[in-house]
């Protein structure tokens, strides 16, 4: 499983590891997977048409700003083919190191 390690308070960029076809378009959603189930990650739709452009390989990636120890964990991306039937998913593990004991909530955003 893909692992991304960042220092506390830094920005983490989590790649969507689903086997997506670059010649198709998808709607993406991210969830944090926990022992008690899954917790949805809020991704503002206003970010869909962001003026910032990332490389094609970073389409559907999740950016977590100001990471804390609470940001650590397993994340799952789900891709739904637009106008199609296929649903794809991938997982990535985030490890946040060097955090002080007190943690604050993280903020999320995505590309495209």
């Amino acid at each position: 499983m893909r692992e991304v390690t960042v220092a506390c308070s830094e920005t983490a960029d989590l790649p969507c590891t689903a086997p997506w076809d670059p010649q198709l378009s998808y709607a993406v959603s991210w969830a944090k997977v926990s022992e008690s189930g899954t917790e949805s990650v809020e991704l503002p739709e206003s970010k869909q048409n962001s003026s910032f452009e990332a490389p094609r390989r970073r389409a559907y990636s999740l950016t977590i700003q100001n990471t804390t120890i609470c940001s650590s964990g397993t994340y799952r991306c789900a891709l739904q083919e637009l106008g199609g039937q296929r649903n794809l998913s991938g997982t990535v593990v985030l490890k946040v190191t060097g955090c002080p004991k007190e943690a604050t909530e993280s903020t999320f955003r995505k590309y495209r």
Epitope: R2, A54, P55, R56
Partner: antibody, heavy 118, light 110 residues
């Protein structure tokens, strides 16, 4: 079969402009980012710039202003103004990693040689 | 700027040995890091993509690891055919970049 191939390399004199062409087949340029890279004899790989699937372009800081990347439906061009002897190199066109598992999308052409000499 | 520093510039290793090549990014690039092998007169050949995923047809003797700013390519059970120059390439961003490639590491097999 998917492929990329560079053309247009030749012997030129300093100050000459030149356009190199990368012809692609088997895939759509509207879905992939395409890069130009060069390699001087006996030297390392030097990134020139990229044109995204969307058409946006980015250049190495040293290449801005003198190199221009553009594309049509099946070609990616690299236009160079006023060549110098330091531009002597093999120029490669490559399709960038598309970001999905199982097939990385990387694809390189054999390169085209540009020699600048008086 | 996102600069890639690759070490060592050159290394000599015996057949059957192991070589480790390091690549350091000046800023975090997550896992958007690829490794290439290049032999004289040929275009680069992809070995590892996304820091640790083995490209199709590449032997498992090649292993990539790392994330953030520190990355490693390890080649074990070295063969004569592994003599080549190896490059890392970041794919995180193309804005404010001098070169997406590291300087290269020449591997000489004794």
């Amino acid at each position: 079969c998917q492929s990329v191939e560079e053309s247009g390399g030749r012997l030129v004199t300093p100050g000459t402009p030149l356009t190199l062409t990368c012809t692609v087949s088997g895939f759509s340029l509207s879905s992939y980012d395409m890069t130009w890279v060069r390699q001087a004899p006996g030297k390392g790989l030097e990134w020139i710039g990229i044109i995204y699937a969307s058409g946006s372009t980015y250049y190495a800081s040293w290449a801005k202003g003198r190199f221009t990347i553009s594309k049509t439906s099946t070609t990616v061009d690299l236009e160079v103004t006023s060549l110098t002897t330091e531009d002597t190199a093999t120029y490669f066109c490559s399709r960038e990693h598309a970001g999905y598992s199982g097939d990385t999308g990387h694809l390189w052409g054999p390169g085209t040689l540009v020699t600048v000499s008086s | 700027a996102y600069d890639m520093t690759q070490t060592p510039a050159s290394v000599e290793v015996a057949v059957g040995g192991t070589v480790t090549i390091k690549c350091q990014a000046s800023q975090s690039i997550s896992t958007y890091l690829d490794w290439y092998q290049q032999k004289p007169g040929q275009p680069p050949k992809l070995l590892i993509y996304d820091a640790s995923d083995l490209a199709s047809g590449v032997p498992s003797r090649f292993k990539g690891s790392g994330s953030g700013t520190q990355f490693t390519l390890t080649i074990s059970d070295l063969e004569c055919a592994d003599a080549a120059t190896y490059y890392c390439q970041q794919g995180y961003t193309h804005s404010n970049v001098d070169n997406v490639f590291g300087g290269g590491t020449e591997v000489v097999v004794k």
